[in-house]
């Protein structure tokens, strides 16, 4: 194992990619450790602000963790000759807040990319596809690890974080060969509808430790190779029939559902029935109710239909009547407001008249008060007709 560290300075690596000489096959960048035998370069916890330019051509595993990279520009790893063997790239915990389009271009063998634990305020839609074409060249990526890439609230752009990540995953259909996708701990409230349809080769999907409330609009139907689906530690309340049927239809899948706040009311009946007969859910005997209060900590598998009741509600016909009544009242209210708006000038004039009348009235009261206050004029007050 050879290693190199900066002898002249401990400052971050600031060489420019454009001016770099072609790397010697066996040289090791300053502040990095290199092993040709292990085909590995580690530039770890070195406060680098840019990707080293003089990476050895043999590198197959590149660890750039714990740095201060901030921005990953287009062609951040493009070299001449290219890093043709680079297969695994780990950039976790490197304070990246921006990954631009084409950041991973010219890495023909890149199979695993880990961007975890970076506060990505901006992830270009073309970060993984490399181009804005509707159909790009397929990415070689097989494993994409994006755990805890959500930026703090004050750094978020005025867009949906879920939407930004989804756009990068589906752009150009470049990730059709992706086998593993980890998206844990990202505060996702929902999963954008079309993402999974564009990732047909997925075998492992980790969505654990998010804030997913429902899977109603998510389709797993075409993920026929899916082996593991991790949904632990979300905010799921119930899985509905459509989702249950899709999961049951996947030939190899194992689903993990621990630590969700299951609501054990009448809507849970189908899921409980399914849980009792399915082999798909791992650790299904650990799933417990969180709500309502009377059902807390009850094991889902031990429930029967009598346990799963809902608070008495109005019959559907009455519900419909009330909905209709609400709509009518809302329309009347809207018309009333419209009339007020259209007659705003008249109303304004009317208001002025009322104000003037009130002023006259108040002056009368004021006059009357003055008379009452003067003892010499008291006997006049009873005859006042103001």
């Amino acid at each position: 194992t050879s290693s190199a560290s900066s002898s002249s300075s401990s400052a971050p690596f600031l060489a420019s990619a454009a001016s770099a000489q072609p790397p010697l096959p066996d040289q090791c960048p300053a502040l990095c450790e290199c092993s040709e035998a292990a085909r590995t370069v580690k530039c770890v916890n070195r406060n680098l602000t840019e990707v080293p330019t003089d990476l050895p051509l043999y590198v197959r595993n590149l660890f750039l963790t714990g740095n201060q990279l901030a921005v990953l520009p287009a062609g951040a790893f493009a070299r001449r000759p290219p890093l043709a063997e680079l297969a695994a790239l780990n950039l976790s915990g490197s304070r990246l807040d921006e990954v631009r389009g084409g950041a991973f271009e010219h890495l023909p063998s890149l199979r695993q990319l880990d961007l975890s634990h970076n506060p990505l305020a901006y992830l270009s839609p073309f970060a993984f596809s490399g181009s804005n074409a509707s159909i790009s060249a397929p990415s070689p990526l097989v494993e994409l690890i994006l755990n805890h890439i959500v930026p703090p609230d004050d750094k978020r752009q005025n867009r949906s974080f879920e939407g930004m990540v989804a756009a990068a995953l589906v752009a150009g259909r470049a990730l059709q060969g992706l086998h593993l996708l980890e998206l844990a701990s990202n505060h996702f409230l929902y999963l954008p509808r079309d993402v999974l349809a564009q990732l047909p080769s997925l075998r492992y999907l980790d969505l654990s430790n998010n804030s997913l409330v429902s899977l109603t609009y998510v389709s797993f139907r075409n993920l026929t190779h899916l082996e593991s689906l991790h949904l632990e530690d979300n905010a799921l309340k119930v899985l509905h029939n459509g989702t249950l049927a899709e999961l049951q239809g996947l030939p190899h899948v194992r689903v993990f559902l621990d630590n969700n706040p299951w609501v054990c009311d009448c809507h849970m009946a189908d899921m409980v029935t399914w849980l009792k007969q399915t082999g798909v859910v791992q650790g299904k005997d650990r799933l417990t109710c969180a709500f309502p209060e009377k059902m807390r900590n009850r094991v889902l598998l031990e429930l029967n239909s009598a346990d799963l009741d809902c608070d008495p509600i109005l019959p559907p016909s009455l519900q419909t009547s009330y909905v209709f009544l609400g709509i009518v009242l809302a329309l009347i209210g809207a018309i009333f407001l419209l009339v007020l708006y259209l007659n705003r000038k008249g109303i304004k004039k009317w208001m002025h008249n009322i104000r003037d009348a009130c002023r006259d009235h108040m002056e009368g009261y004021h006059y009357r008060y003055e008379i009452n206050a003067d003892p010499r004029l008291t006997n006049l007050s009873s005859n006042s007709d103001v």
Epitope: R111, Q112, L180, Y204
Partner: antibody, heavy 122, light 110 residues
Framework: EVQLEESGGGLVKPGGSLRLSCAAS????????VGWVRQACGKGLEWVSI???????YYANWAKGRFTISRDNSKNTLYLQMNSLRAEDTAVYYC????????????????WGRGTLVTVSS | DIQMTQSPSTLSASVGDRVTITCQAS??????LAWYQQKPGKAPKLLIY???TLESGVPSRFSGSGSGTEFTLTISSLQPDDFATYYC????????????FGQGTKVEIK
């Protein structure tokens, strides 16, 4: 120098057990995809088992339930526990490593040990 | 269960010959295929991975091609050191398989 060295082979009776070890030097095994491949005398290569960086394990259909792959990162060593051994398990067992890091998928073996011979006979 | 089938089982050739070995997967494995060379009493040696990427230090006379289910290893000009047994191996999945390797092709002197 980077190398893998198997040990633990030998003669065992049918139904017996054996634990093979593979010690790595010059590399940290914990990150890599590592596995076992065997070869009976005069026969082809036969894949046995694999373990990924995530700890995920896979076995050939015929090895399930009898063989167990494991790793001790502190000792930088890979193991293969073989139970209920049969005569047809007689082979040279190789330990092999993929040069690429993987959490879960793929495994092409660019580094191999010299192998250790397991003979199952009464 | 993915099965790998190599052909031919044995191939007789002379130094300087162009040699082609094929490997067929029972279902699509994308580009997830490797080729190995093994000599008697030795461990296998990786030649090509991901169907066509030449492993470091392997002579350029070796090349690989194909994707999906059909793959080919070509030795453009056979050298004395190339007489050995060659194996293909799928790296697409290790779930529910009997063997990841093909049965081997022995290249012998004609």
């Amino acid at each position: 120098e980077v190398q893998l060295e198997e040990s633990g082979g030998g003669l065992v009776k049918p139904g017996g057990s054996l634990r093979l070890s593979c010690a790595a030097s010059g590399i940290d095994l914990s990150h890599y995809v590592v596995g076992w491949v065997r070869q009976a005398c005069g026969k082809g290569l036969e894949w046995v088992s694999i373990i990924y960086g995530s700890g995920r394990t896979y076995y050939a259909n015929w090895a399930k339930g009898r063989f167990t792959i494991s790793r001790d990162n502190s000792k930088n060593t890979l193991y293969l526990q073989m139970n209920s051994l049969r005569a047809e398990d007689t082979a040279v067992y190789y330990c092999a490593r993929d040069a690429s890091v993987s959490v879960y998928y793929w495994g092409y073996f660019d580094l191999w040990g010299r192998g250790t011979l397991v003979t199952v006979s009464s | 269960d993915i099965q790998m089938t190599q052909s031919p089982s044995t191939l007789s050739a002379s130094v300087g010959d162009r040699v082609t070995i094929t490997c067929q997967a029972s279902q699509s494995i994308g580009s997830e295929l490797a080729w190995y060379q093994q000599k008697p009493g030795k461990a296998p040696k990786l030649l090509i991975y991901r169907a066509s990427t030449l492993e470091s230090g392997v002579p350029s006379r070796f090349s690989g091609s194909g994707s999906g289910t059909e793959f080919t290893l070509t030795i453009s000009s056979l050298q004395p050191d190339d007489f050995a047994t060659y194996y293909c191996q799928q790296g697409y999945t290790y779930s529910e398989i009997d063997n990841a390797f093909g049965q081997g092709t022995k290249v012998e002197i004609k």
